[in-house]
Interface confidence: low
């Protein structure tokens, strides 16, 4: 049996994946649950099995097709249901009419690389992954650099208010190890949120030339 309040949150990666998290305050005792997606104007429907991520929350990914296929558009509405098995029947635990392009969270940027590094600056590039062609240039990025003796949470955020898949970090310290991360967000969507942070890219600035002020 299920009691208590539940929260059901899903995001569309803009191409062929809807990721969902369902949180339930009450106890779920050995119950099998799944998310079911039923689009209003498509011939397919899809399910995924909810797997525990903590004591009171479950997650799953609805794989709608090939990673770069455009499975939904701005006019689609997808009815998403959490269904849990009760004996031989399935019970609806949560439901929402999901507008994919109002609830976007893109994949983390990939292919981070150092284009050029000097003593005090470093030019880094990256690529976006599985992002809809609908966005064209309507994306923004946040980046952060981890310097020695600090944590990621302390790192100041650098905002790029346009689709710019590179950055030139300046005022760096020579011969120092840094790490860099970036994330992306479309400008579209009332409930759109930032992508996860990219995998960190480690780089080291060049040592200062001997006999010169630094």
């Amino acid at each position: 049996a299920v009691n208590g309040t539940s929260q059901f949150t899903c995001f569309y990666n803009s191409r062929a994946n809807i990721s969902c998290v369902w949180s339930q305050d009450g106890a779920l005792q050995d119950t099998s649950c799944q998310v079911h997606a039923w689009p209003d104007r498509r011939r397919w429907n899809q399910t995924c099995e909810l797997l525990p991520v903590s004591q009171a929350s479950w997650a799953c990914n609805l794989i709608l097709g090939a990673p770069d296929s455009q499975k939904l558009t701005t006019v689609d509405i997808v009815t998403l249901r959490v269904l849990c098995r009760e004996g031989v029947r399935w019970r609806v635990m949560a439901i929402q009419d999901f507008k994919p392009f109002e609830n976007l969270r893109l994949m983390a940027p990939i292919s981070l690389q150092v284009v050029h590094v000097e003593t005090h600056r470093c030019n880094i590039s990256w690529e976006i992954s599985q992002a809809s062609h609908y966005f064209e240039r309507h994306l923004e990025f946040e980046a952060r650099t981890l310097s020695p003796g600090h944590t990621w949470e302390e790192a100041p955020l650098l905002t790029l208010k346009q689709k710019q898949e590179w950055i030139c970090l300046e005022t760096l310290t020579p011969d120092t190890q840094y790490e860099f991360q970036v994330r992306v967000k479309p400008l579209q969507g009332e409930f759109t949120t930032w992508s996860p942070w990219s995998q960190p890219l480690a780089f080291r600035t060049k040592p200062a030339a001997l006999g010169k002020d630094t």
């Epitope: 701005t74 006019v75 392009f101 062609h133 609908y134 064209e136 309507h138 969507g189």
Partner: nanobody, 123 residues
């Protein structure tokens, strides 16, 4: 004030072609995603095609895919709809629409509209 003026409609035989044009004035053209809609007698206005501000991304309703082509000339502040292999069921008033948000262009209530141009396809 933003204004859209369509032209190019007319009477054509089935299988023929027409090219509609829509000129935008009163604002910067490249700010807008542009679209064509149509309304047949006794029916609701329906989306036909759209083109994003840069012209790189186009979208079509399934019934016109492969027959109609939407394009724009940002130097002339004009969007076009090239209609080939026309069918009697394409008969309608064709409307031009503009929206600064690509994602709202199919939404009937959030667009700026032209006055429409009549297209009649006879069999």
């Amino acid at each position: 004030q933003l204004q859209l003026v369509e032209s190019g409609g007319g009477l054509v035989q089935a299988g023929g072609s027409l090219r509609l044009a829509c000129a935008l004035s009163g604002d910067v053209f490249v700010r807008y995603t542009m679209a064509w809609f149509r309304q047949a007698p006794g029916k609701e206005r329906e989306f036909v095609a759209s083109v994003t501000d840069s012209g790189r991304t186009t979208d079509y309703v399934a019934s016109v895919q492969g027959r109609f082509t939407v394009s724009r000339d940002n130097n002339k502040n004009t969007v076009y709809l090239q209609m080939n292999s026309l069918k009697p069921e394409d008969t309608a008033v064709y409307y031009c629409a503009a929206n600064t948000d690509y994602f709202q262009i199919r939404s009937l209530d959030r667009n700026t509209w032209g006055q429409g141009t009549q297209v009649t396809v006879s069999s």
